[in-house]
Interface confidence: low
């Protein structure tokens, strides 16, 4: 069976091969072909011509239909580490390193502390942190991580919260809290992460992060 | 009918201290974060303060960190604003505001004008 379809490519090749060389020796105005027989060969050849092109621009249109498809509905998601900082902040630092995600410009790390927004929408939005704390060295007050939300010409608020007691365990207990919800943004919204006692975060690889993506 | 009244601005000398209050109404105030917002003579809003609902968490812009302290008393729907060391770009009038899903709720403001 496969001599058989062997045979008929070979075969196609050999036709396509004798009128490839039909039209050169049209081209050449050679006196063993008549003309009639050229002009009827040139239109064929002609007609092919224009398949492939209309071809070509059936799928150029139907590409760039799904890059239209595609930009009006980007893919928005970021994923960025944890950053120990020397400021005394309670808002947690971050940092495009490691095996971070950033998609487009349409999300943005500003500042170092927020993660911005351009296109409204519902994103799920989720942060990790562990930290690393001990009952006798911490106040009587639990470790507490918040999510909190910026939306232009509006004053910040929590979206979520989550709660640890400190550990009995010395120096200190490694702990994680997480934290993740579905939340309508506005453009220009920033979302960023509080912490009772950033000193206490733990910053090693893969303990602390803080992401976004776009439903 | 959410309602929320501020008072206690007024003329204070740089370094001086004064406190606000906002008499909240039409809501459950204990369900609900609630913030200081100030706007300064031709500035845009800035928030200021926010605490938590039950009162255990309170935030703080860098500009007023250390100096100014929020606080509530839930069973008086009331929300403070104690503002110590007061510097002349203090100057604003002062919102207390309640945070909605699609906008935010506001007081009608009071002045606190920080000059010597």
């Known amino acids: 069976h496969r001599r058989l379809d062997k045979i008929e490519d070979e075969r196609n090749l050999h036709e396509d091969f004798v009128f490839m060389k039909t039209i050169q020796r049209c081209n050449t105005g050679e006196r063993s072909l008549s003309l009639l027989n050229c002009e009827e060969i040139k239109s064929q050849f002609e007609g092919f011509v224009k398949d492939i092109m209309l071809n070509k621009e059936e799928t150029k249109k139907e590409n760039s239909f799904e890059m239209q498809k595609g930009d009006q509905n980007p893919q928005i998601a970021a994923h960025v580490i944890s950053e120990a900082s020397s400021k005394t902040t309670s808002v947690l630092q971050w940092a495009e390193k490691g095996y971070y995600t950033m998609s487009n410009n349409l999300v943005t790390l500003e500042n170092g502390k927020q993660l911005t927004v351009k296109r409204q929408g519902l994103y799920y939005i989720y942060a990790q942190v562990t930290f690393c704390s001990n009952r006798e060295a911490s106040s009587q007050a639990p470790f507490i991580a918040s999510l909190c939300l910026k939306s232009p010409g509006r004053f910040e608020r929590i979206l979520l919260r989550a709660a640890n007691t400190h550990s009995s365990a010395k120096p200190c207990g490694q702990q994680s809290i997480h934290l993740g919800g579905v939340f309508e943004l506005q453009p220009g919204a920033s979302v960023f992460v509080n912490v009772t006692d950033p000193s206490q975060v733990s910053h090693g690889t893969g303990f602390t992060s803080f992401g976004l993506l776009k439903l | 009918e959410v309602q929320l009244l501020e008072s206690g601005g007024g003329l204070v000398q740089p370094g001086g201290s004064l406190r606000l209050s906002c008499a909240a109404s039409g809501f459950t105030f204990s369900n609900y974060q609630m913030a200081w917002v100030r706007q300064a003579p031709g500035k845009g809003l800035e928030w200021v303060s926010s605490?938590?609902?039950?009162?255990?968490?309170?935030y703080y812009a860098d500009s007023v960190k250390g100096r100014f302290t929020i606080s509530r008393d839930n069973s008086k729907n009331t929300l403070y604003l104690q503002m110590n060391s007061l510097r002349a770009e203090d100057t604003a009038v002062y919102y207390c505001a309640k945070p909605g899903k699609n906008f935010d709720y506001w007081g009608q403001g009071t002045l606190v004008t920080v000059s010597s």
């Open positions: 605490i938590t609902s039950e009162g255990g968490s309170t």
